[in-house]
């Protein structure tokens, strides 16, 4: 009878055991375990009659189609063999033991005690045959195994091979190199690749195979397992298949496709193949003179650039518009796509403006091409050139004008100070009783006029002040401070200012150069009840041109014992001399009360303490504090009076020989103007020297003669 | 013509606020200063402070700087004076003046409680 | 601030005589630079606002009548109406222009 078995172990024995077992019996066991197992069978107890070659009693063991053993007896002879330690194996996991006694026994057998288990199958190591086993790796697990692929691969639908994803190349480059996957390792198995060379409209491509080519083929059939196919529009080439390369091909198209087919078996090292594109020629190419072409080259086709420049100094004209470079292209019908530009010699140009310069020309013809040369200078004697340099520009290869130190900035012209067209006369009479001023005598010389119309009827005032700078005119606080207030310094509204420069003559203001108010700055600390730092700024609104009748005065330095005792120093002014004429008089100079050309006086810088002394004496409250000195003579006679207020009084510095303004029209006592033992009070512009270039925005250094050093 | 028009009476409880308005015509209104000038029933003229308005410049009268606040629209040439916590004595005409030659109509303003 | 103190408080004058009103300042009110006296007058008749008649002390408005005169300098000015009008019942005011501002008492004139 059969026994069928399913279990993962058992345990086999032989009928009646451990007695002895019957005559004339067979028993089959079936053993079945799952696939991914074998049965492993070992014996613990064999005793078995002994025949010749296991003819009498026996145990089979044996598979679907095969014997793995016979045993019988009790112990190996050269014909009869017992299983002792010996396992059997089943190569699969089906298993068949057959037991068989004959019909007699002369002695007492007792039998066999076997055992089985199911074993794990290791395929990785056990499967041999390529048609079976993983392509790349393979893992094993108790009952079964699976595959896996190495990366950049995919598994195939067959569990077993490797395949890649290679249906999607593009190629539009000119020039490439397009190689089976892995090249020169083996190819993988089962893939469809797809290369598309994909080309503009014009050119041609040629495909080279290289030496080493390697596809799995056929003796008899042509390419029936892997192979590469070259579709060129619906003109398929190949297949190509085994060791020897193909022909190069002219595939006459701008657009190929190349496709290669690889089975699930073979280990072939694949191929590789440039490829070209080739187009229509273009003609020889010959520079433009004082140019050059890049690349060089004897032959040139289809889609290629040529880069024209021209030599240093020189630019690429075309179509009337200069460029740096040109670059034309071989078109596919094998023309050019433009014709040789020129090399036209770099322009400068001419020159820019130089604000109170002058620019002359040293190449003749007053050419302004590459390598010629301009001299920049500036207005002289009103205006100089900062830090002296050259002022030599040269036309640079980048079509610039170009100065060694400045580059290609312009130089700055920036006003002289102090030094007047016409030279001031040593001997002087007084301002009352008049002695006109020259013109040009004191071009800082500038008339401040107020009108406050922000009132019911207009306020207007006028005062006197200095040019400093372009912009810029210093005059005392107290001129252009709002007049309504008692004790509080408000400035006056920049709306309400007029500034006259150049003015000699105040019935004939054509000639003066009159100027709005930018800004009005007041000392932060002018004290309208001692008029201690009487001291202003306006800005004017727009720069004023110099010349003879319009030049600034120079700053002093910054000194706080300000100018020596008795030195002389002028004033000018186009002052009052009777006190009570009127503003509108003044300023319409309908009245003869009023100078109307321009006076000035030399007066002496008086010790301070003799003046501290002559002010502390009167009913009052007069205080000279040190930033203020007084002028004037003892006897009087000579004095500054209400109109000068706020105008420079001037000292010549003997070092630069240059006008200094060392002091402002401040105040002066209660008596008339030129009154005995009545000094003149000056602003002391030397303790304000840092605060004046502060508001004007500049460093001391910067105008040539802006403060005398 | 040049004028300056005022707004209309106010009556008020002490405590409270009051805004006169002042339009302007007939002239450039900001550039030149508005004055503010009140008179109580029976009494003189007391200057509350003015306004410039094209630059907001202000000046007060000390009694009135906690109490008074001038501003002014130059869009629409309006001068505006607001008083705030008023009490009974504040009860008075109040005068808008163009620096000093031309004056509105007044604008009387009670406070009662 | 600067007080102007006015005289007298009314005045009762016959139509076509003089008529003169005293102002006087606590602070000079000359300004050197502008060489004015910032002192003005003004006339407000009853139910009325306060008019122009006299600005830097001496110096008529415009359509104002050459009746009236202004004088004095620094601190003591003077309004002279030199022959009243019935229509110059009015009460009249000076007033300083340096800030603050402040105006005089006022003067009443009547007709006698």
């Known amino acids: 009878h059969t026994v069928e078995l399913n279990d993962m172990f058992g345990q086999i024995q032989s009928p009646g055991y451990p007695d002895s077992y019957p005559s004339d019996s067979e028993v089959t066991w079936n053993i079945t375990v799952p696939d991914g197992f074998r049965i492993k069978l070992y014996f613990m107890h064999f005793n078995l009659e002994s025949s010749y070659l296991c003819e009498y009693d026996y145990v089979k063991v044996e598979t679907e189609d095969q014997v793995l053993a016979t045993f019988c007896g009790r112990e190996t002879t050269d014909t009869e063999q017992t299983p002792g330690q010996e396992v059997v194996l089943s190569p699969g996991s089906f298993m068949s033991i057959t037991f068989r006694s004959d019909f007699s026994n002369e002695e007492r057998f007792t039998g066999f005690d076997a055992h089985y288990m199911a074993v794990d199958v290791d395929e990785c190591k056990e499967r041999e045959d390529e048609e079976l086993s993983c392509d790349h790796y393979c893992h094993n697990y108790i009952g079964g195994y699976y595959c896996s692929c190495r990366f950049g691969y995919i598994l195939h639908t067959d569990n077993r091979t490797c395949r890649v994803e290679c249906s999607d190349n593009l190629f539009t480059q000119r020039t490439g190199v397009i190689t089976s996957p892995d090249f020169p390792n083996p190819y993988p198995k089962s893939s469809e690749c797809l290369y598309t060379i994909e080309l503009e409209e014009g050119f041609m491509v040629n495909l080279q195979f290289e030496d080493i080519f390697d596809i799995e083929d056929h003796p008899e059939v042509p390419c029936p397992y892997d192979y590469i196919k070259i579709k060129v529009g619906p003109k398929v080439l190949g297949p190509f298949c085994g060791e020897k390369a193909p022909e190069p091909i002219n595939t006459q198209s701008h657009s190929v496709l190349i496709l290669f087919h690889s089975d699930n078996s073979g280990e072939n090292r694949g191929w590789r193949l440039s490829y070209r594109a080739a187009g229509n020629e273009c003609p020889e190419l010959q520079p433009p003179v004082h140019g050059k072409i890049e690349p060089s080259q004897a032959k040139y086709s289809f889609k290629d650039q040529v880069l024209i420049s021209c030599d240093t100094g020189y630019k690429v004209l075309k179509d009337n518009v200069e460029m740096d470079t040109f670059q034309i292209e071989c078109l596919k019908d094998g023309t050019w796509s433009n014709k040789i530009p020129t090399c036209k010699i770099v322009d400068c140009r001419a020159p820019g403006e130089l604000e109170h310069g002058l620019v002359t020309f040293s190449t003749r013809n007053n050419l302004t091409t590459y390598k010629s040369e301009i001299r920049y200078s500036c207005q002289e004697p009103y205006y100089k050139m900062l830090n002296n340099i050259t002022g030599i520009y040269t036309c640079s290869a980048q079509g610039v004008w170009m100065n060694k130190v400045l580059g290609r900035s312009l130089p700055t012209c920036l006003p002289e100070c102090g030094q007047p067209s016409r030279s001031l006369p040593s001997l002087v009479k007084r301002i009352i009783g008049g002695r006109n001023a020259e013109p040009g005598l004191f071009p800082w010389q500038a008339l401040i006029v107020v009108e406050d119309t922000s009132r019911v009827p207009n306020d207007k005032w006028f005062g006197s002040g200095a040019l400093l700078s372009e912009s810029w005119i210093l005059t005392a606080a107290h001129v252009l401070r709002s007049q309504r207030r008692d004790t509080t310094v408000i400035p006056v509204s920049k709306e309400h200012v007029t500034v006259y420069l150049g003015l000699h003559d105040v019935r004939d203001k054509s000639g003066a150069v009159n100027s709005s108010a930018a800004r009005v700055v007041l000392h932060p600390d002018f004290n309208i009840q001692n008029y201690n730092h009487d001291i202003a700024l306006v800005q004017l609104q727009e720069p004023v041109p110099l010349g003879p009748h319009v030049m600034p005065v120079c700053l002093p330095r910054l000194e706080p014992e300000g100018p020596s005792p008795h030195m002389l120093g002028l004033v000018a002014g186009w002052g009052i001399s009777n006190p009570n004429v009127t503003v509108d008089e003044i300023i319409s100079s309908g009245t003869r009360t009023l100078s109307d050309v321009l006076q000035y006086v030399k007066l002496p810088v008086v010790p301070h303490a003799e003046c501290k002394t002559s002010y502390e004496s009167r009913s009052g409250n007069y205080s000279v504090t040190e930033n203020m000195f007084c002028a004037g003579y003892y006897e009087g006679g000579k004095d500054t009076c209400l109109g000068d207020s706020g105008g420079a009084f001037v000292i010549l510095d003997d070092l630069s020989q240059r006008w200094v303004v060392q002091g402002l029209v401040s105040w002066g006592g209660p008596e008339e103007c030129g009154s005995k033992q009545v000094y003149g009070v000056y602003t002391k512009v030397s303790n304000y020297v840092d605060w004046v270039w502060e508001q004007m925005g500049s460093p001391q250094g910067r105008a040539p003669g802006g403060t005398v050093s | 013509q040049v004028q300056l028009v005022q707004s209309g009476a106010e009556v008020k409880k002490p405590g409270a606020s009051v805004k006169v308005s002042c339009k302007a015509s007939g002239y450039t209104f900001t550039g030149k200063w508005i004055e503010w000038v009140r008179q109580a029933p029976g009494q003189g003229l007391e200057w509350i402070g003015e306004?410039?308005?094209?630059?907001?410049?202000?000046d007060y009268n000390e009694r009135f700087k906690d109490r008074a606040t001038f501003t002014a629209d130059t869009s629409t040439s309006t001068a505006y004076m607001e008083l705030s916590s008023l009490r009974s004595e504040d009860t008075a005409v109040y005068y808008c003046?163009?620096?000093?030659?031309?004056w509105g109509q007044g604008t009387l303003v009670t406070v009662s409680s | 601030d600067i007080v102007l103190t006015q005289s007298p408080d009314s005045l009762a004058v016959s139509l076509g005589e003089r008529a003169t009103i005293n102002c006087k300042s606590s602070?000079?009110?000359?300004?050197?630079?502008?060489?004015?006296?910032?002192l003005a007058w003004f006339q407000q008749k009853p139910g009325q606002s306060p008019k122009l008649l006299i600005y830097w002390a001496s110096t008529r408005e415009s359509g104002v009548p050459d009746r009236f005169s202004g004088s004095g300098s620094g601190t003591d000015f003077t309004l002279t109406i030199s022959s009243l009008q019935a229509e110059d019942v009015a009460v009249y005011y000076c007033k300083q222009s340096y800030i603050p501002f402040t105006f005089g008492g006022g003067t009443k004139v009547e007709i006698k």
């Open positions: 602070q000079n009110l000359f300004n050197s630079r502008t060489r004015k006296n910032y």
């Open positions: 003046v163009r620096s000093e030659d031309l």
């Open positions: 306004i410039l308005p094209g630059s907001g410049s202000t």
